[in-house]
Every structure is written in C-alpha cells, then in structure tokens.
Amino acid sequence: FPMFKRGRCLCIGPGVKAVKVADIEKASIMYPSNNCDKIEVIITLKENKGQRCLNPKSKQARLIIKKVERKNF
C-alpha cells in the first residue's frame, strides 16, 4: 500500500455520512496537523471489515467527536 506523504490526509474525499452503529468496533479522531489541515474521523469496522472515513460534518461524526472529547478532557 502507498506510504503516507507529508501534506496528505488519511482519508480520500469527504467520507461517508454514516456507518451502522452495530458495525463500529472503534472510532479514531485525527486532529488537524502538518500532514492534514482538517479533522478526520476514522471508523474501524467489526469482523475485520476494514476502516472507513466518516464525513466530519455529518451528524454522526459530530456526536462521535463530542463523545470522545468528553471522555478525554
């Protein structure tokens, strides 16, 4: 697989609007950095079904971000 290059986000395009909650193993939030100037929400799916990018502007992503931030701070 291609290696990440500086100035490149992990996600391609805006991402999906929603992922079935039952399919979510884990949600990770990548905050803006030197590599990517936007927030990215990465969903790890259950049963080794890979990962998907969630549109950070979607309702579901906003809820996830809120939940994670509440947990961390």
């Epitope: 697989f1 291609p2 990440f4 490149r8 986000c9 992990l10 996600c11 391609i12 395009g13 805006p14 991402g15 999906v16 990465i42 799916l45 079904k49 890979g50 990962q51 998907r52 990018c53 969630l54 549109n55």
Partner: nanobody, 126 residues
Framework: EVQLVESGGGLVQPGGSLRLSCAAS????????IGWFRQAPGKEREGVSG????????YYADSVKGRFTISRDNAKNTVYLQMNSLKPEDTAVYYC???????????????????WGQGTQVTVSS
C-alpha cells in the same frame, strides 16, 4: 440505481496493450474512489489500481506499476485502465468498483468498495 459497467477486455498477445473502461451510472464519480481489481481462476480478487475523483491521486499494486495507468473523465463519468506490456500472469477477470470514505491505506482493498461491476475478461496468450 447505481451501476458500473466494464468494457474493453479481450484476447491479447504478451507485450500487447488493452484499455479497459468503467462507466458509472446512477451516481457521479465526485467523492468516490474508483478501484480496479482482478481475479484469476482459483485466486483471490486483488487490487490493481485506484483513483480519487476528488484530488486525482492514483494508486497501483507493485505488480502493475509502470505498465498500467488509471485515469478518469468526470464529464463522461468513466474511469479507464490503460494496460501496456501485458504478461500471461495478467490474465484474469477485471472488475471496477466504487467506494466512499476510503482511506489511502485501504485503496487496494476490496473491503473499501460498496459497488461492483460484473467484470470483463482479459486473456494474455500467444
């Protein structure tokens, strides 16, 4: 209804070229990643190449780097795979697929794609 239709396959001699087309209908390519995959008899479906319609970035499996070129025409809602210097081991059914929310790391993984075409046969033989 979302549909992907591949065309351009056929029989070609080793060293020859083919251009595959993947025409999308029922959705626009914007925001989607289009991937090309292939499956040889008795083998797993493997990722060959992918292209992002949002930023135009392209991805290739090591086995086809320098020989295959992926491109897109958003106006025609079509993605192409130009295959040069074909080898007998390139013989397979070639599929195109569309996915949204794809990570760069997962472009060549079939898990990243939601919609698939029916495939087109490519045979490389003398």
């Amino acid at each position: 209804e979302v549909q992907l239709v591949e065309s351009g396959g056929g029989l070609v001699q080793p060293g020859g070229s083919l251009r595959l087309s993947c025409a999308a209908s029922g959705f626009t390519l914007d925001d989607y990643v289009i991937g090309w995959f292939r499956q040889a008899p008795g083998k797993e479906r493997e990722g060959v190449s992918g292209i992002s319609s949002s930023d135009g970035s392209t991805y290739y499996a090591d086995s086809v780097k320098g020989r295959f070129t992926i491109s897109r025409d958003n106006a025609k809602n079509t993605v192409y795979l130009q295959m040069n210097s074909l080898k007998p081991e390139d013989t397979a059914v070639y599929y195109c697929a569309a996915g949204m929310g794809v990570l760069r790391l997962w472009v060549l993984s079939k898990l990243s794609y939601d919609y698939w075409g029916q495939g087109t046969q490519v045979t490389v033989s003398s």
